[in-house]
């Protein structure tokens, strides 16, 4: 059998095979050692017994999408049946005091591979044996502790495969320079040690995407905005737009990146080299936000221009350089740059909101019958922007970290936006007061530290903003 007979049905065309050479990967036309690595079709009854105590689940993840030319990383995590785990030696053991369908196990091991490998024979002086090989016959890499690695992972994509020895997690990075754009399929088959052979325990596949568009995400935030995820923001307050380029392998690390913004409010184009920008909308309504990101990324060099036709006889004026039609200075540099673009579009809604809130006065309320430990304090509050519908006060310790009391109540405020909020304080001392005014779309906060005096008529209230 060949690798492509074993590893999935996707058969790339000859063009795909030729144009998607992955560095360090091998052609799936190579022979597969079925004696050491048996092949079972989906639905084969042997899968049921491939692992003691249930089925092993392989979870394949990737950091797709990948900009063409960058590295894409794949990780496979093995999830064992309940009550089973991998120990420090790579053996699979039962968790202590864990009960599964079979009850508590007397044998601590599910698979004691250490014992198997110490027992193995047929090895020469290098520790190599006929069974410590991959499906294509390549020997296992011999680094310290390799015997603790009891799983063989075979990755397969684009008509090529990659073999890796590992534990319950493995990671493979692939350079996408030669990968065709669009969605591609990665398939992984996992084998476990079984004496001097291997047994398949899991298969998993996942789609990854290679793109020539820079993957761009934008987060939008604004002070006083009640819900940052609804794309509704407030008039007359700056919105912070922060661009995140999905580039986990830092392919664009040394690129000059330009951000071209159109905010859709007739303020024209704004070009920046900073990934963060602030913009204030001064009108209510719905606006179309557009961002274009441009980066000069490493890319393939264009083919050299064809040489000019050679004259039939050497011309004296050309001199010895005549054998170099490009001229020395024109030899193409293999580290070429290519402009890559990314786009982001969003529709945002701008509405009125509470822009600012201020405590302009605090007054100790003199009670005719003062409580033993209680002080009433009035906060006179003003606001700008829309009219609030609720007020919340959070009273906490002087560091503003440990909340002691929180109260919210509806308010009815006139257009001048002047209101008095009365709150009770238990005992003297210094308090942090957070006062928030809110409506459907906005939430404006102000804070103050106040000192509540002892109930001594001579003492007065102090406020420090």
């Amino acid at each position: 059998k060949r690798f492509h007979d074993v590893l999935g049905n996707e058969r790339p065309s000859a063009y795909m095979r030729e144009h998607n050479q992955l560095n360090g990967w091998s052609s799936d036309e190579n022979d597969w050692n079925e004696k050491l690595y048996p092949v079972w079709k989906r639905g084969d009854m042997r899968w049921k017994n491939s692992w003691k105590g249930g089925r092993v689940q392989a979870v394949l993840t990737s950091d797709s999408p990948a900009l063409v030319g960058s590295n894409i990383t794949f990780v496979v995590n093995l999830v064992f049946p309940r009550c089973q785990k991998e120990d420090a030696n790579g053996n699979i053991v039962y968790e202590k005091n864990c009960r599964n369908e079979a009850g508590l196990s007397a044998d601590p091991y599910v698979y004691n591979w250490t014992a198997w490998s110490e027992d193995s024979d047929g090895e020469n002086g290098t520790g190599q044996s006929h069974h410590n090989v991959f499906p294509d016959g390549k020997p296992f890499p011999h680094h310290p502790g390799w015997r603790r690695w009891n799983f063989v992972y075979v990755f397969h994509t684009l008509g090529q495969y990659f073999q890796k020895l590992g534990r319950c997690s493995v990671r493979v990075s692939v350079n996408t320079a030669n990968v065709t754009l669009g969605p591609q399929l990665m398939e992984v088959t996992v084998y476990r040690r079984h004496g001097r052979a291997y047994v398949p325990i899991a298969q998993v596949k996942d789609v990854y995407v290679v793109t020539d568009q820079i993957p761009v995400f934008v987060t939008m935030s604004q002070k006083n905005d009640r819900n940052s995820s609804d794309e509704t923001f407030l008039k007359d307050l700056p919105i912070t737009f922060d661009v995140l380029i999905h580039d986990p392998s830092h392919f664009l690390n040394y690129s000059t990146i330009n951000y071209k913004w159109s905010f859709g409010d007739n303020t024209g184009l704004f070009v920046s080299i900073n990934h963060t920008v602030n913009h204030t909308y001064v009108l209510n309504g719905t606006f179309s936000l557009n961002l274009t990101v441009k980066a000069a990324a490493p890319g393939p060099c264009p083919p050299p221009p064809p040489p000019p036709p050679r004259p039939p006889k050497p011309t004296p004026s050309l001199g010895p350089a005549g054998d170099n039609p490009l001229g020395l200075s024109e030899i193409p540099d293999e580290n070429c740059q290519i402009n890559r673009y990314g786009h982001f579009q969003a529709t945002i809604t701008i509405v009125e909101g509470i822009l600012e809130v201020n405590i302009i006065q605090t007054t100790d309320v003199l009670m005719l019958v003062p409580g033993p430990d209680s002080s009433l304090i009035d906060f006179v509050v003003t606001c700008q922007g829309s009219i609030p519908t609720e007020v919340c006060t959070i009273i906490s310790d002087p560091t503003c970290e440990i909340t002691q009391n929180a109260v919210c109540s509806p308010v009815d405020v006139d257009e001048m936006c002047l209101l008095t909020v009365r709150r009770a304080f238990n005992g003297s001392g210094t308090y942090c007061v957070n006062l928030t005014l809110g409506d459907d779309t906005s939430l404006a906060l102000t804070s103050t530290l106040i000192s509540v005096p002892d109930r001594d008529p001579a003492s007065s209230l102090r406020m420090a903003n």
Epitope: D63, T73, V75, N77, K85, P144, R171, S249
Partner: antibody, heavy 116, light 108 residues
Amino acid sequence: EVQLQQSGPELVKPGASVKISCKASGYTFTDYYMNWVRQSHGKSLEWIGDINPYHGGSTYNQKIKVKATLTVDKSSSTAYMELRSLTSEDSAVYYCARNWPYFDYWGQGTTLTVSS
Amino acid sequence: DIQMTQSPASLSASVGETVTITCRASENIYSFLVWYQQKQGKSPQLLVYNAKTLAEGVPSRFSGSGSGTQFSLKISSLQPEDFGSYYCQHHFGTPPYTFGGGTKLEIK
């Protein structure tokens, strides 16, 4: 015995660059990923990125705005992290740590102070 | 990215007591979780990996449990050398592998 020996403390000005080293001994350097983790004063740990010393391929944490470049010198079994365009927010203890996907041995840490 | 939330942020206990620290993941991470211990002014040290497996040389009074999104680290019969900070970290899927906010364990 596995050991990761990091370079000494650094005091640099905002906008400058710094290169921290981590010399590995007691194991085969190219067999394990080398990670870099930072810890701002009194804060939690943040993974910066890792490098595969075998071929030099690196992966970074995009969520933290650290301008880091990871490199290795296989001949001296040393990993390096260069930090550029430093600001006061980059002041922290920087650790190198071995292995993937969790870290079984850590360097002693390099304290970086960015101050004018 | 997967977020890790650790609680409590700090806790006081006496030698001989048993304490439990919890860690919650924002999505299913199966059993791919580690715990580290960090003493004041020192580097973190690996305690537990794969949620339940004790690292080499870690005393058996430490035990990890949980899977999916909820995890805990239990320290039975606290010893003086156990005081310090503890961090959880997931190791599922592709990087970044985020840490919890930490739990500071102090002597009462």
